[in-house]
């Protein structure tokens, strides 16, 4: 069975910036990856990137860079100022699309030692 | 405009063979996954056959298994369905229809249909 | 396979009428659902996708909504063109599956 994975980092030199990055753990070629924030797309959640491995990437702020790492991971740096910037307990999905299969979510969030009040 | 338009279709035996056609325009064929999907007399839909925009990867329903073939010819802008050792049950309208990435793999585009009528 | 249970199977109703279609998916499809409408002889023509995003050219009175396994199609105000009928789909997982369709007639 497929599997997605997801990992998200807080990056050293900006506390409030971000980076996300999932992979498919499956044979089927990737038609699309969602990326979301605050839930599942299908939950409530908000889309920061969609990429395609043809027709590009589409991203909304507080999206700042969506990248293809390999043919089946992603990449993604989120903006780290303004209202809608993340906090430390967000959740973060990736949702990847292979057709004729369909669809497969993971979501993820920051771990516990990564809060910013525990760093030095 | 985009326009897909199925031939093929007729009157044929139990145990015979038929190969519908499905010429695409107005689009880049080669970017889409596509799709047969069949609706027998007074009945629903059903997803036949598909087949991937790089013709990696296929589905067939359970019951036409080894005895339908999807295929597809990106230089021609043309899909087919081989259809071998045809039963009664097989006898419905075809249509060929186009999967939009970003619309979740909905089907956003149809062809007008084909009869296929199995009877002795 | 995913189950798509449509409800009603058929529906009598007026013009000007609001009508509401559901579908329950017999497992978690995403947002991974569309709607179609057909009319008689005709093909299948999308309306919805995405759970709630309209189709390019489809009427404002079409609307769609739901998550998880239950999803809805409302047409807030029937027009004489909007007798047909409606399918409900799921594109979460292979096989993509309909619904049994909901027809809607004329009271």
């Known amino acids: 069975t497929p599997e997605v994975w997801v990992q998200v980092r807080m990056e050293a030199t900006e506390l409030s910036s971000f980076t996300i990055r999932c992979g498919f753990l499956g044979s089927g070629s990737i038609s699309l990856v969602t990326v979301s924030w605050g839930g599942p797309n299908g939950a409530g959640g908000t889309t920061l990137a969609v990429l395609h491995p043809e027709r590009g990437i589409r991203q909304w702020a507080p999206a700042r860079q969506a990248r293809w790492e390999t043919q089946s991971s992603i990449s993604l740096i989120l903006e780290g100022s303004g209202a809608s910037s993340p906090c430390a307990n967000t959740t973060f999905c990736c949702k990847f699309a292979s057709f004729p299969e369909g669809s497969w979510e993971a979501c993820g969030s920051l771990p516990p030692s990564s809060d910013p009040g525990l760093s030095a | 405009e985009v326009q897909l338009v199925e031939s093929g279709g007729g009157l044929v035996q139990p145990g015979g063979s038929l190969r519908l056609s499905c010429a695409a325009s107005?689009?880049?064929?080669?970017?889409?996954?596509m799709s047969w999907v069949r609706q027998a007399p007074g009945k629903g839909l059903e997803l036949v056959s598909a087949?991937?925009?790089?013709?990696?990867?296929?589905y067939y329903l359970d019951t036409v298994k080894g005895r339908f073939t999807i295929s597809r010819d990106n230089a021609k802008n043309s899909l087919y369905l081989q259809m071998n050792s045809l039963r009664a049950e097989d006898t419905a309208v075809y249509y060929c229809a186009r999967h939009e990435d970003y619309y979740g793999f909905a089907m956003d585009y149809w062809g007008q249909g084909t009869l296929v009528t199995v009877s002795s | 396979d995913i189950q798509m249970t449509q409800s009603p199977s058929s529906l009598s109703a007026s013009v000007g009428d609001r009508v509401t279609i559901t579908c329950k998916a017999s497992?978690?499809?995403?947002?991974?659902v569309a709607w179609y409408q057909q009319k008689p002889g005709k093909a299948p023509k999308l309306l919805i996708y995405y759970v709630s995003n309209r189709f390019t050219g489809v009427p404002s009175r079409f609307s769609g909504s739901g998550s998880g396994t239950d999803f809805t199609l409302t047409i807030s105000s029937l027009q004489p063109e909007d007798f047909a009928t409606y399918f409900c789909?799921?594109?979460?997982?292979?096989?993509?599956?309909f619904g049994q369709g909901t027809k809607l007639e004329i009271k």
């Open positions: 789909q799921q594109a979460y997982r292979s096989p993509w599956t």
């Open positions: 087949i991937n925009s790089n013709v990696i990867s296929t």
């Open positions: 107005g689009f880049t064929f080669s970017s889409y996954h």
């Open positions: 497992q978690s499809v995403s947002n991974d």
